[in-house]
Interface confidence: low
Amino acid sequence: SAHAHPRDSCPLGPGRCCHLETVQATLEDLGWSDWVLSPRQLQLSMCVGECPHLYRSANTHAQIKARLHGLQPDKVPAPCCVPSSYTPVVLMHRTDSGVSLQTYDDLVARGCHCA
Amino acid sequence: SAHAHPRDSCPLGPGRCCHLETVQATLEDLGWSDWVLSPRQLQLSMCVGECPHLYRSANTHAQIKARLHGLQPDKVPAPCCVPSSYTPVVLMHRTDSGVSLQTYDDLVARGCHCA
């Protein structure tokens, strides 16, 4: 079938391949201090690391990309590490009428894969 | 709001930023010559190019990533160019009982964004 099994063990060594990592950021870092009230500090999960051949392939396209990158590295980029799913986060922010709680569905990564 | 407008003009010059590009590949390139009968050659649309700050941001997470990359480039990677949608492709392939047509929904990219 077109779907080879995505590889799950990192051939580059511990912590080198595509994985979820927490980055601490303040509202000032994000440029949000003027409109977000809370939380003042966010633990942002982000996808970092490399995508060696077939590691955590998102889909058939990513597998093809990995293969063609091996054949034509100057023309076809390697797959890269991006979120596969997100965790909803609630922010309290200023509105014209006061304060509001709003859920953001696409703000913090929950899982990563190579696309 | 958390959603800044993704930027659509490429500040790096024509063809340098994240875009769809056609790569020609044979079944041999893909390692599929033993099970796919047709087409012998595929025009594969792939996402290539760079993702400068806020260019075609996929979502809020990508905008945050772009901003934090500006602040901590060694820790937070820049967003990268990946498919935003796919075009279904029909492949004719061998089966135990003969020949079958199968649609692959995630094989050829139709649009790109920075994630």
Partner: antibody
Amino acid sequence: QVQLVQSGAEVKKPGASVKVSCKASGYTFTSYGINWVRQAPGQGLEWMGWITAYSGDTNYAQKLQGRVTMTTDTSTSTAYMELRSLRSDDTAVYYCARGPGQYADVDVWGQGTMVTVSS
Amino acid sequence: DIQMTQSPSSVSASVGDRVTITCRASQGISSWLAWYQQKPGKAPKLLIYAASSLQSGVPSRFSGSGSGTDFTLTISSLQPEDFATYYCQQASQFPITFGGGTKVEIK
């Protein structure tokens, strides 16, 4: 902290060239672009061009095309702007300014370099 | 090239006043607009990027709004240190262009 430190004031004769340097510190030089902006005495800001530190790609203002060259030296985290065939209306303060990523907004500026063109 | 037209070119105001400066682009630039403050003999300082985002360390009395072609910088309550010249800049495409500047003077 993030800093851009420019070379000192210059006095040049018409027809000569000037090369202004801009040394970056406090951040990864190759992850950012550098803009050059000038300001004639009592006038507004004029964008001259932009260079990506990581690849050396440039984009120059049309009116300066052919007279300006922007370069970077990644080994010393320094950007350079050379302006040739100087005229009296090139008298200005020249600023280098960093942009986040390769983006065009400029968040950190050098202190400026006064270039006087006079016979 | 995209032309940026700023108005007024100068404004006289008192401490505590609300000051509004406008900037108009000759074509749509989405939200790719920045505002800078410049004091005599000093380099410009970024106040607002992406039309409405406050740069880190800038007082919250500064705010930006607008999208497309029309943009506004507002200083909600003018302070003594705010007397300066303000510039808008479009970051939508090369060549980057600045507005002509607005000088905020003491009345």
